[in-house]
């Protein structure tokens, strides 16, 4: 056969399907690889083709589009399977062809089983909630264009394995679940699930988030530098150690990139000849803020060193701020009898 | 500890209503929701309906569909069946079962019954 | 609806021996699927839930299994308190709906 551009295994598209589901999975040529839609590509005479490789097989082979009660269809730009079962599992291929023209992806698609508490080793999506902010809410997600609109589906939220019924701060609305105030408390697992029927059958989509509360952009503040500070000096003598750590504590920020860096003469350790190593630490509290500590290090400090600038320097989104740490060379305690000697006026 | 309770229940004449009654105790009611599932004599259990914890949904079996309505008042810790249209096949004992809370939806606790007796 | 079939229709054992109901979906239902024992002029006892977990209370010689569309609950043991009739029921639908029973007999 011809030439066909092959874009390979797009793993990026993990796709997870729980078994026992509808799944309707539209092929990725049109969403990341070529520069017009299927519409487009239909009307041009292009002509799309599924085929799959079976979980731990090579050989690649047609999809059964007949089997019984149309299992798994093909419409327009998506594979539909309703439902899915386990040896679904394996490495799907859309490929746009005619006479002249050919270009290909496969994507890995797993099933996967759950229990009846919905656990199970799908990779859960995480919504990050700010504590104490209002009401807030989240949507049930990938439910659209199963059904139509004159379906109207019955929706259950559950949080872990327990449906939500009269939670204190948590209203099922529909497709919506609303958290009044989201406490520390409501972090957890929550799953919808929506039932519908078609054709005579009943079908289920289930769909787990994991909801992280976090701090509240209200309570937001720039990084705030706790170590070095003006109670601490670093006294050294030549040749010994100098450990220094730069805390900083940063407020949680939705996609903020916290940064900490040491300037040494303001030039970064990097750009200077001195042998100095740091070392990092992150922690994290209960709502995500965060407290970086970079520990710079130098084995063997010398008198010059101890003449340097050192200073901390911290960023996020709310702003920069730097403090410098007091370093000072050790007096050396003077020899006792060259005391006694000055003291009396010896020369 | 958990209890449901039916009342209501006695002979009627087809084509007249009847309402029965389960009143809930031993448990917070309106975290729950309840369903009415009937036993006709010597036969199996057929599902009735079932209300949400809080009323906002309500589904039927098809047999029933149109003639029965589920309510309930959580002030009260009451759940009802209004049937109206009655025939002579809905005779039957009804329980309320309370649905335990978890996906599978389980009838953790029974009431033990009301006869309805549809006769001319 | 759901069409729930169970098998036997009835059913005679004797003391100590191991026994099973098996129920069929007409679709797959998962395995929001549970079991119940009724005797006469009571009400019905839950006994399995989910497919296969056993509810509080319930001795273990009782054992569910199964997905999608056919399960099986087993009597390891047969005990004499145990002669009653079973139940299975389908709780994937919002219309929910019953096996139509099995009757477990002393031989």
């Known amino acids: 056969s011809e030439r066909c551009d092959d874009w390979g295994l797009d793993t990026m598209r993990q796709i997870q399907v729980f078994e026992d589901e509808p799944a309707r999975i539209k092929c990725p040529l049109f969403e990341h690889f070529l520069k017009f839609n299927y519409s487009t590509a239909h009307s041009a005479g292009l002509t799309l083709i599924w085929y799959w490789t079976r979980q731990d097989r090579d050989l690649e082979e047609p999809i059964n589009f007949r089997l019984p009660e149309n299992r798994i269809s093909k419409e327009k730009d998506v594979l539909w399977f309703r439902p899915t079962l386990l040896n679904d599992t394996g490495n799907y291929t859309c490929m746009l062809r005619n006479t002249t023209y050919c270009s290909k992806v496969a994507f890995p698609l797993e099933v996967v089983q759950k229990d009846s508490c919905f656990n199970s080793p799908m990779k859960l999506p995480v919504h990050k909630l700010y504590i104490e902010y209002g009401i807030q809410r989240i949507t049930c997600p990938n439910v659209d264009g199963y059904f139509p609109s004159s379906v109207k589906p019955t929706i259950t939220w559950y949080m872990g394995c327990y449906k939500i019924q009269n939670f204190n701060n948590v209203i099922p609305e529909g497709m919506n679940l609303s958290f009044l105030i989201a406490l520390i408390s409501n972090n957890g697992n929550y799953t919808c699930v929506v039932t519908y029927p078609e054709n005579g059958r009943t079908f289920h989509l289930t769909r787990t988030l994991t909801v992280k509360v976090v701090g509240s952009p209200k309570n937001a503040v720039p990084p705030v530098i706790h170590s070095p500070n003006d109670h601490v000096v670093y006294e050294k003598e030549p040749g010994e150690e100098l450990l220094i750590p730069c805390t900083v504590y940063f407020s949680f920020l939705m996609d903020s990139r916290n940064e900490v860096w040491w300037t040494i003469d303001g030039k970064k350790p990097d750009d200077i000849t001195i042998d100095v190593t740091i070392n990092e630490s992150i922690s994290h509290s209960r709502t995500e803020d965060e407290t970086r500590t970079q520990i710079l290090s130098i084995k063997k400090v010398t008198s010059e060193d101890l003449k340097r600038s050192y200073v901390c320097h911290a960023r996020s989104a709310k702003g920069e701020v730097a403090k410098a740490a007091k370093v000072k060379q050790k007096v050396p305690a003077p020899r006792y009898t060259v005391e006694l000697a000055c003291g009396f006026g010896a020369t | 500890q958990v209890q449901l309770v039916e009342s209501g229940g006695g002979v009627v004449q087809p084509g007249r209503s009847l309402r029965l009654s389960c009143a809930a105790s031993?448990?917070?009611?309106?975290?729950?929701?309840i369903h009415w599932v009937r036993q006709a004599p010597g036969k199996g259990l057929e599902w009735v309906a079932v209300?949400?914890?809080?009323?906002?949904?309500?589904f039927y079996a098809d047999s029933v569909k149109g003639r029965f309505t589920i309510s309930r008042d959580n002030s009260k810790n009451t759940l009802y069946l209004q049937m109206n249209s009655l025939r002579v096949e809905d005779t039957a004992v009804y329980y309320c079962?309370?649905?335990?809370?978890?996906?599978?939806?389980?009838?953790?606790?029974w009431g033990q019954g009301t006869l309805v007796t549809v006769s001319s | 609806d759901i069409q729930m079939t169970q098998s036997p229709s009835s059913l005679s054992a004797s003391v100590g021996d191991r026994v099973a109901i098996t129920c069929r979906a007409s679709?797959?239902?998962?395995?929001?699927l549970n079991w119940y024992q009724q005797k006469p002029g009571k009400a019905p006892k839950l006994l399995i839930y989910?497919?296969?977990s056993l509810q509080n209370g319930v001795p273990s010689r009782f054992s569910g299994s199964g997905s999608r569309t056919d399960f099986t609950l087993t009597i390891s043991s047969l005990q004499p308190e145990d002669f009653a009739t079973y139940y299975c029921?389908?709780?994937?639908?919002?219309?929910?709906?019953f096996g139509q029973g099995t009757r477990l007999e002393i031989k």
């Open positions: 079962a309370r649905e335990e809370g978890i996906a599978v939806a389980p009838f953790d606790y």
């Open positions: 031993g448990f917070t009611f309106r975290n729950y929701g």
């Open positions: 209300i949400w914890y809080d009323g906002s949904n309500k």
């Open positions: 679709q797959s239902i998962a395995s929001y």
């Open positions: 989910g497919a296969s």
């Open positions: 029921q389908q709780s994937y639908s919002t219309e929910i709906t």
